[in-house]
């Protein structure tokens, strides 16, 4: 008679996580009596998967009854597949003794699993940068198999080019990880973009999961100053105005200078909002002339986001205007864009 | 198709080093473990070392701890054996050859082979 | 360590002979037996696994058997390309360990 052969029909199975595999395996003889014996791997370091006579696998079931006399078909389902499943099995039969002894391998199935990917993160640099320069962004993505994926960036919509991919570990590896950064250069206008990290893969069946950072979170514009003289409001009385223009973030603090010496500051609280998401805000200054005998200058000066103060100074021309008798106070009248002190 | 290609033949006087490598094709280097067997001049062959190339870890046979380093160096797909103090026992062919397995934890037979180095260590 | 035994260090051959090498572990290994074949200058080539799994794109003259701890490999139809040097490896424990060979020759 021919001498048994075991036969494992499938070179290799993929397999979603989560799902179970089915592993074939058939001898094609009944003798010798003895049990069959699954095993990840050979060599001192295979494991067993599953001992038809003994043992507990709460994960494997046999595909047919393997307890009836004539059975010859020893396929096994292992189910909740995880990417830590992958590897070649062998069915073997042993020979019934004491102890059973080994007496043929099948050629061996090797298995691997398919996983997803986990939703892209994305972050940006830790400290905001100003338009004109270029920032980096990364995108992470854990647990995916097999190692085969594609990453793209976007802008608003448009697609990306210079960005570095990276995909650990370099070797086989149960799962993976995918690894990108992208360089993205600021203007003034991107406080309302977006960038979009997007990755493309076997188990995601064409709908390819997205990552998102706002820019809002990463840019600084600096606000642009105009300081200018208002007619003048009362007599003896000059409003002065500082325009602070296209600003973002909202943080920022002024303080009006006269003559270098602080007369107030403030923090910018109503503020408009322009279309493209920067800011305005306006803060004016109601002076005396009259207390004044030289010119003043005053300066408006802003801390925006934690910033070096930037300033603009207007020149108050004192000899134009009659000089009241005794007046001591500077600038009594002082105010802003939402309240009037007089 | 997978290759494995070894450096060159080295000639080397007792007491000396050499270091000599094994570079991987074809397949992806960290898929499959790597082994370095030893075959001195019209003898057998003597398995020396298992690399885990995932890892890193060594396996090695009793008769060659010490003087022996096996290193890596994953970005070049490469194996290297360094031989320390060299003795004219060590004359031999040296041979790296590849696990079966791709998921490579369990070490068995050998499928690919290098062409072998022959080491010569004569004063 | 596992000793693996060649007892035959050398085999005459006539071309179209069936062939019988034969390995013997100095203790039980199961069916963790390969077999490769070697030529001067060559490196060697693996023939058999698991005792009796014919490695892809070995001709089917070449057959493994046994298990325990007495292996053989048969030539079923002896060409003049088999003539070689035939070592068998156990991997059922660590070291691995290699036969000495046993090398076949012609009449």
């Known amino acids: 008679e021919e001498e048994l052969q075991v036969i494992q029909p499938d070179k290799s199975v993929s397999v979603a996580a989560g799902e179970s595999a089915i592993l074939h395996c058939t001898v094609t003889s009944l003798i010798p009596v003895g049990p069959i014996q699954w095993f990840r791997g050979a060599g001192p370091a295979r494991e067993l998967i599953y001992n038809q006579k003994e043992g507990h696998f709460p994960r494997v079931t046999t595909v047919s009854e393997s307890t009836k006399r004539e059975n010859m078909d020893f396929s096994i389902s292992i189910s909740n597949i995880t990417p830590a499943d992958a590897g070649t099995y062998y069915c073997v039969k042993f020979r019934k003794g004491s102890p059973d002894t080994e007496f043929k391998s099948g050629a061996g199935t090797e298995l691997s699993v398919r996983a997803k990917p986990s939703a892209p993160v994305v972050s940006g640099p830790a400290a905001r940068a100003t338009p004109q320069h270029t920032v980096s962004f990364t995108c992470e993505s854990h647990g995916f198999s097999p190692r085969d994926i594609t990453l793209k960036w976007f802008k608003n919509g448009n697609e990306l080019s210079d960005f570095q991919t990276n995909v650990d570990p370099v070797g086989e590896s149960v799962s993976y990880s995918i690894h990108s950064t992208a360089k993205v250069v600021l203007t003034r206008e991107d406080v309302h973009s977006q960038v979009i990290c997007e990755v493309a893969h076997v188990t995601l069946q064409g709908d390819p999961l997205r990552g998102t950072a706002n820019l809002s979170e990463t840019i600084r514009v600096p606000p642009t100053l105009e300081v200018t003289q208002q007619p003048v409001r009362a007599e003896n009385q000059v409003n002065v105005t500082c325009q602070v223009r296209k600003f973002y973030p909202q943080r920022l603090q002024l303080t009006w200078l006269e003559n270098g010496n602080v007369s107030r500051t403030e923090t910018a609280s109503t503020v408009t909002e322009n279309k493209d998401g920067t800011y305005n805000w306006m803060s004016w200054l109601l002076v005396n002339v009259s207390a004044h005998r030289d010119d003043v200058k005053l300066t408006c000066q802003v801390e925006h986001d934690g910033q070096p103060a930037v300033s603009k100074s207007h020149d108050l021309k004192v000899s134009a205007h009659p000089k009241e008798q005794g007046s001591n106070t500077a600038a009594e009248n002082t105010g802003s864009n939402e309240r009037n002190i007089y | 198709q997978i290759q494995l290609v070894q450096s060159g033949p080295e000639l080397k006087k007792p007491g000396e080093t050499v270091k000599i490598s094994c570079k991987a094709s074809?397949?992806?280097?960290?898929?499959?473990?790597m082994s370095w067997v030893k075959q001195a001049p019209g003898k057998g062959l003597k398995w020396m070392v298992w690399i885990n190339t995932y890892s890193g870890v060594p396996t090695y046979a009793d008769d060659f701890k010490g003087r022996f380093a096996f290193s890596l160096e994953t970005s070049a797909s490469t194996s290297y054996l360094q031989i320390n103090n060299l003795k004219n026992e060590d004359t031999a062919t040296y041979f790296c050859a590849r696990d079966p397995h791709y998921y490579g934890s369990s070490p068995a037979w050998f499928v690919y082979w290098g062409q072998g180095t022959l080491v010569t260590v004569s004063a | 360590d596992i000793v693996m035994t060649q007892s035959q260090k050398f085999m005459s051959t006539t071309i179209g002979d069936r062939v019988s090498i034969t390995c013997e572990a100095s203790q039980i290994v199961g069916i963790a037996v390969a077999w490769y074949q070697q030529k001067p200058g060559q490196s060697p080539k693996l023939l058999i696994y698991s005792a009796s799994n014919r490695y892809t794109g070995v001709p089917d003259r070449f057959t493994g058997s046994g298990s325990g701890t007495d292996f053989t490999l048969t030539i079923s139809n002896m060409q003049s390309e088999d003539l070689a040097n035939y070592f068998c490896q156990q991997y059922s424990a660590y070291p691995f360990t290699f036969g000495s060979g046993t090398k076949l020759e012609v009449k």
């Open positions: 074809g397949y992806t280097f960290t898929t499959y473990g």
